[in-house]
């Protein structure tokens, strides 16, 4: 006979503890970092992977890229605020009570402030680039193959729904993925194409979020897609308002 | 095989106590749920509480909170369920059942009589 | 707490019968549903969970299905030993709660 607590994980998010201790015996897991009750049939949100990832913490890893509207995650990890829903609050501060802006991917939108900078609403992240390249190959992939495989992978392993993955761009060696999700198009039960990406992220430096499945495995016709570096741009609904200072810089 | 095994039949006074006993047996009882549930005569069934012996986390029908009292020893592999001031209406066969994602064993069941 | 009504209360059939018993939520469950047989004097039995999951051991000839908050029991083809008093749970949230019951008669 099985025991409950052997059938008791969460597929979605191994930075969970679970217990079959919910109604009627239901497994039932909570977020390491905020104990917050995750919905194990989809994504965990990117707000409570990043607390669950600070709890337990590794070596920090940073992308620095300037860009122009598109905002990119140049503050690497930190220790966010999560609103009972598990998305990021808007605004975000830390212990030294230095506070920002963040999008609804977690990402700073204003200049850094202090405990009286305001942040009205969270603002939506609607567009999001996925620039990756890929190491050399004996040849370029099938465009077309790319794409369907990419495809694929959003919606089978990141239950992302089709209609977000909005192309598939390739110029040996360099792949664009674009995720677009209007807040209007967004339906209850639809995974975030923030989430997504942040999963997709996650697998691609090897550092699945998934419990007990394999790493990702990408081919494209059984040939190896390896990714040697990757940037996310973020576009947001609303224009991040940052001093020309920074623009300028 | 999983075995819940309850104490007897009782016989009780309005404005007593009542505990019934519920010995588990042919799996690890730290990792499953206790539910206790109660039938009245001629009625349907009524949920009254939960453990969980492997945190000693409980939850309780609102209906019997402060009234009802859910423990667990582990040394022996047995769940208990108090009930306090009894009145007629608490008459009823009283089962506890080892759930597990809404799959249950059942005990054979209880029966307490509060009579006067 | 989610209220769950059961119907019919009772009803009647005959061996050979196909029997459907509905059970309705006050709101959505989430497929944590759960259907019990019960026969007079014994404790209840276990016969599908998660809505439509059969208990190992369970004859094929019950069979759970719905979602939301609309959810069936069915006996394809009654047998003698099912004559019953079949009851849902719900296990969506805290407290859990029970249809009211349908008895089973043989017609």
């Known amino acids: 006979h099985t025991a409950a607590q052997d059938n008791c994980t969460c597929p979605t998010n191994k930075m969970t503890v679970c217990s079959p201790d919910g109604p009627g015996g239901r497994c039932q897991c909570r977020a390491l970092g905020s104990g917050m009750a995750v919905d194990c049939s989809t994504l965990t949100s990117k707000c409570l992977l990043l607390k669950a990832r600070m709890s337990a913490p590794k070596n920090a890893r940073t992308l620095v890229r300037p860009s122009e509207h598109a905002l990119v995650d140049n503050d690497g990890l930190y220790d966010p605020d999560c609103d009972p829903e598990g998305r990021f609050k808007a605004r975000q501060c830390n212990q030294t009570s230095v506070c920002w802006c963040v999008n609804s991917v977690g990402v700073r939108r204003t200049d850094k402030g202090d405990l009286s900078l305001r942040c009205d609403e969270l603002v939506r992240t609607h567009h999001i680039l996925i620039d990756l390249r890929h190491r050399p190959t004996a040849g370029a992939f099938n465009h077309s193959d790319l794409d369907a495989e990419l495809r694929r992978l959003f919606r089978e392993r990141y239950r992302l729904h089709p209609k977000f993955v909005a192309a598939v761009h390739y110029e040996q060696p360099t792949i664009q993925i674009e995720l677009r999700q209007n807040t209007s198009q967004k339906a209850a039960g639809d995974v975030d194409i923030g989430d997504a990406a942040y999963y997709f992220e996650r697998d691609i430096k090897g550092e699945s979020l998934f419990q007990g499945r394999g790493g990702l495995d990408l081919r494209v016709r059984g040939e190896p897609l390896q990714v040697e570096r990757t940037l996310i741009y973020y576009l947001d609904e609303i224009p991040p308002k940052f001093s020309m200072k920074r623009l300028t810089a | 095989q999983v075995q819940l095994v309850q104490s007897g039949a009782e016989v009780k006074k309005p404005g007593s106590s009542v505990k019934v006993s519920c010995k588990a047996s042919?799996?690890?009882?730290?990792?499953?749920?206790i539910n206790w549930v109660r039938q009245a005569p001629g009625q349907g069934l009524e949920w009254m509480g939960q453990?969980?012996?492997?945190?000693?986390?409980?939850h309780y029908n609102q209906k019997f909170q402060g009234r009802a009292t859910l423990t667990a020893d582990k040394s022996t592999n047995t769940a208990y369920m108090e009930l306090s001031s009894l009145r007629s209406e608490d008459t009823a066969v009283y089962y506890c059942?080892?759930?597990?994602?809404?799959?249950?064993?059942w005990g054979q069941g209880t029966l307490v009589t509060v009579s006067s | 707490d989610i209220q769950m009504t059961q119907s019919p209360s009772s009803l009647s059939a005959s061996v050979g019968d196909r029997v459907t018993i509905t059970c309705k939520a006050s709101?959505?469950?989430?497929?944590?549903l759960s259907w019990y047989q019960q026969k007079p004097g014994k404790a209840p039995k276990s016969l599908i969970y998660?809505?439509?999951r059969l208990v190992d051991g369970v004859p094929s000839r019950f069979s759970g299905s719905g979602s939301g908050q609309d959810y069936t029991l069915t006996i394809s083809s009654l047998q003698p030993e099912d004559f019953a008093t079949y009851y849902c749970?719900?296990?969506?949230?805290?407290?859990?709660?029970f249809g009211g019951g349908t008895k089973v008669e043989i017609k």
């Open positions: 998660r809505a439509n």
């Open positions: 042919g799996y690890r009882f730290t990792d499953y749920v």
């Open positions: 709101q959505g469950i989430n497929n944590y």
């Open positions: 749970l719900q296990y969506d949230e805290f407290p859990l709660t």
């Open positions: 453990i969980y012996p492997g945190s000693d986390s409980f």
């Open positions: 059942a080892r759930f597990f994602e809404g799959l249950a064993y």
